[in-house]
């Protein structure tokens, strides 16, 4: 059965900057990766970044910069001043459309007694829709 | 047909402000994003930002970022730049552009908006 | 910042020629690539997106190609209206790029 994971690091430099690393488990090929915050996509939760493998990288403040890390994996940085910045119980979700398995979607937020700039290993996150 | 009508040219002092607007026709304006371009007389395409009407999300090219607001206005399907602590640097041709989240990028562009600062 | 470089600022040709502007990206952007044409006092218009991709009414003389760093667009049989500037855009990741431009001149 395919995952997907979440990792929520805050950045030990600015303290309300938030790193996002998302990664699906499964054999098929990925045809786009959306992360958003406050719930999943589409269930009350805003879109922050749209990954397309060949189309390129969409992405909203306070996105500040999107990025394939592997062919199966994401990184989002999010700045963290302004009225829209993230805060230390904010969720973040990662969908994952692949073929052949559908659409695979996982939440996670920052661990609750994390230091700055330390995370939790990532782990699979509780899927919590898979279409 | 798609249109994107750009009001008309503008001539500012330093310091000063402007607001260039993008009215557009023929489409359904919050399904698509508005893109904004800088050309300097005689030079290349710089992009400036982008917005989302449908959703409000906005992403500035951090060169701009500290000078530009960009807005929309769903109720008149019109999109918005406004350049604050305008310097000579910032005389040019600004452009919007209709684009697709991941697709059609740029497909359609307004006629272009003169901005010239002189004392 | 993705850097994509035209380096033929000029290209002199003569009608019925077939003329090829390249551009090269600093890095990979896979195929997300536009190319657009501007004529003198105009605005620019979309010719090609994801690298090969013609835009409804581009007339099939125009032709993209290329993926990864290095693309092309081919226009055949030059026509006297094809005179005009010619620009690249990476749509990989923001900020969106462009080239500096590639002017065609009709001998």
């Known amino acids: 059965t395919p995952e997907v994971w979440v990792q929520v690091r805050m950045e030990a430099t600015e303290l309300s900057s938030f790193t996002i690393r998302c990664g699906f488990l499964g054999s098929g090929s990925i045809s786009l990766v959306t992360v958003s915050w406050g719930g999943p996509n589409g269930a009350g939760g805003t879109t922050l970044a749209v990954l397309h493998p060949e189309r390129g990288i969409r992405q909203w403040a306070p996105a500040r910069q999107a990025r394939w890390e592997t062919q199966s994996s994401i990184s989002l940085i999010l700045e963290g001043s302004g009225a829209s910045s993230p805060c230390a119980n904010t969720t973040f979700c990662c969908k994952f459309a692949s073929f052949p398995e559908g659409s695979w979607e996982a939440c996670g937020s920052l661990p609750p007694s994390s230091d700055p700039g330390l995370s939790a290993p990532p782990t699979p996150a509780p899927i919590l829709r898979a279409d | 047909q798609v249109q994107l009508q750009q009001s008309g040219a503008e001539l500012v002092r330093p310091g000063a402000s402007v607001k260039v607007s993008c009215k557009t026709s023929?489409?359904?304006?919050?399904?698509?994003?508005i893109e904004w371009v800088k050309q300097r007389p005689g030079q290349g395409l710089e992009w400036i930002g982008v917005?989302?009407?449908?959703?409000?999300?906005?992403y500035y090219n951090d060169k701009f970022k500290v000078k530009t607001t960009l807005t929309a206005d769903k109720s008149s399907s019109t999109a918005y730049m406004q350049l604050s602590s305008l310097t000579s640097d910032d005389s040019a041709v600004y452009f919007c552009?209709?684009?697709?989240?991941?697709?059609?990028?740029?497909?359609?562009w307004g006629q272009g908006t003169l901005v010239t600062v002189s004392a | 910042d993705i850097v994509m470089t035209q380096s033929q600022k000029f290209i002199s040709t003569s009608v019925g020629d077939r003329v090829s502007i390249t551009c090269k990206a600093s890095?990979?952007?896979?195929?997300?690539v536009a190319w657009f044409q501007q004529k003198p006092g105009q605005s620019p218009k979309a010719l090609i997106y994801?690298?090969?991709t013609r835009h409804t009414g581009v007339p099939d003389r125009f032709t993209g190609s290329g993926s990864g760093t290095d693309f092309t667009l081919t226009i055949s049989n030059v026509q006297s209206e094809d005179l005009a500037d010619y620009f690249c855009?990476?749509?990989?990741?923001?900020?969106?790029?462009f080239g500096g431009g590639t002017k065609l001149e009709i001998k």
């Open positions: 023929g489409y359904a304006f919050t399904n698509y994003l």
């Open positions: 917005i989302n009407p449908g959703s409000g999300g906005i």
């Open positions: 994801l690298a090969s």
């Open positions: 890095q990979s952007v896979r195929i997300a």
């Open positions: 855009l990476q749509h990989w990741n923001y900020p969106y790029t």
């Open positions: 552009a209709r684009s697709e989240t991941h697709d059609t990028w740029f497909a359609y």
